[in-house]
């Protein structure tokens, strides 16, 4: 079958890194500079991605594979294949349209990206606040007052995962 297809379509013999050149009697021509073909049998080569501006080159373009970009320091990748770079903020901040802003009281962000999230509401699990939350850190929940009564076990099983709620102010 492969032999038959080759006879019908000479382009199927063109390997990755080449293209089937209609202007030259369908012979396999190497991809020109700044272009690539990652599969065989292609009639054109694709233009290499340019990693410039906020992007920098993680992997150079070759005749058979596209360039791969990441972001300059102070930025992080977003989207498939690092299609965008978003500015880093400090822990305790989130990125808004007007730049990095501190997390509001009652919320935190422990990363350089993403949004500020509400502190865990310990009381939803019948626990008390052991360590107060900050802009950079969530509250730490401790055993409920009942758990601390004489004879009660001091080991609390982990609470099931849930969406964090607002802690009492």
């Amino acid at each position: 079958f492969e032999r038959t297809r080759s006879l019908q379509d000479p382009c199927s013999n063109c390997p990755a890194g080449t293209f089937c050149d209609n202007n030259r009697n369908q012979i396999c021509s190497p991809c020109p500079p700044n272009s690539f073909s990652s599969a065989g049998g292609q009639r054109t080569c694709d233009i290499c991605r340019q990693c410039k501006g906020v992007f920098r080159t993680r992997k150079e373009c070759s005749s058979t594979s596209n360039a791969e970009c990441d972001c300059t320091p102070g930025f992080h990748c977003l989207g498939a294949g690092c299609s965008m770079c978003e500015q880093d903020c400090k822990q305790g901040q989130e990125l808004t349209k007007k730049g990095c802003k501190d997390c509001c009281f009652g919320t935190f962000n422990d990363q350089k990206r993403g949004i500020c999230r509400p502190w865990t509401n310990c009381s939803l699990d019948g626990k008390s606040v052991l360590v107060n939350g900050t802009k950079e850190r969530d509250v730490v929940c401790g055993p409920s007052p009942a758990d601390l009564s004489p004879g009660a076990s001091s080991v609390t099983p982990p609470a099931p995962a849930r969406e964090p709620g607002h802690s009492p102010q």
């Epitope: 700044n34 501006g53 906020v54 992007f55 770079c85 978003e86 500015q87």
Partner: antibody
Framework: QVQLVQSGAEVKKPGASVKVSCKAS????????INWVRQATGQGLEWMGW????????GYVQKFQGRVTMTRNTSISTAYMELSSLRSEDTAVYYC?????????WGQGTLVTVSS | DIQMTQSPSSLSASVGDRVTITCRAS??????LNWYQQKPGKAPKLLIY???SLQSGVPSRFSGSGSGTDFTLTISSLQPEDFATYYC?????????FGPGTKVDIK
């Protein structure tokens, strides 16, 4: 001081090619990319592409792909931009510019006139 | 591609006036925004880079602000030599693109 000096004005016929040069001085030529920008009379600035003088790597705007070639001769610190298959709408002033992020130094411009 | 728009396209002002030109990007470009001044028959000249950093040798009456998609060039007190066309440009990603320009002329 940093200077980019471009070649003189050219008059070309439709279908011909033009090669504009840009000689750099006052800095290490291979340290910064050279970009090319054109401006038709009374119009805005149009970015054409870039070249890394160290590696020779280039990147072109899609609309010029296949018609533009950017090269360099590091021994004489000169960048070149060649545009082929010229048409009347390619009549413009062509600028080279050093890229340090922004384009901080520009050549004086080369007027290319395409006329039959 | 990232589109850049500028407003106004032209304005008339007098020496000493405070002039503000705005530039908008079609997507967030963080602070990868530059401003250039161009006079007739001359090459563009870099004024502001990184949205707000003043290029060496540029008078302090020029200032830039903004991040994300909205940017402003301000001339605090217009001087006779400031009558020119001003362009914004994004250097966030290729193809690098310029705004259409704002022509500042004498009232």
């Amino acid at each position: 001081q940093v200077q980019l000096v471009q070649s003189g004005a050219e008059v070309k016929k439709p279908g011909a090619s033009v090669k504009v040069s840009c000689k750099a001085s006052g800095y290490t030529f291979t340290s910064y990319d050279i970009n090319w920008v054109r401006q038709a009379t009374g119009q805005g600035l149009e970015w054409m592409g870039w070249m890394n003088p160290n590696s020779g790597n280039t990147g072109y705007v899609q609309k010029f792909q296949g018609r533009v070639t950017m090269t360099r001769n590091t021994s004489i610190s000169t960048a070149y931009m060649e545009l082929s298959s010229l048409r009347s709408e390619d009549t413009a002033v062509y600028y080279c510019a050093r890229e340090t992020g922004p384009f901080d130094y520009w050549g004086q411009g080369t007027l290319v006139t395409v006329s039959s | 591609d990232i589109q850049m728009t500028q407003s106004p396209s032209s304005l008339s002002a007098s020496v000493g006036d405070r002039v503000t030109i705005t530039c908008r990007a079609s997507q967030s470009i963080s602070i990868y925004l530059n401003w250039y001044q161009q006079k007739p028959g001359k090459a563009p000249k870099l004024l502001i880079y990184g949205a707000s950093s003043l290029q060496s040798g540029v008078p302090s009456r020029f200032s830039g602000s903004g991040s994300g998609t909205d940017f402003t060039l301000t001339i605090s007190s217009l001087q006779p030599e400031d009558f020119a066309t001003y362009y914004c440009q994004q250097s966030y990603s290729t193809p690098f693109t310029f705004g259409p320009g704002t022509k500042v002329d004498i009232k």
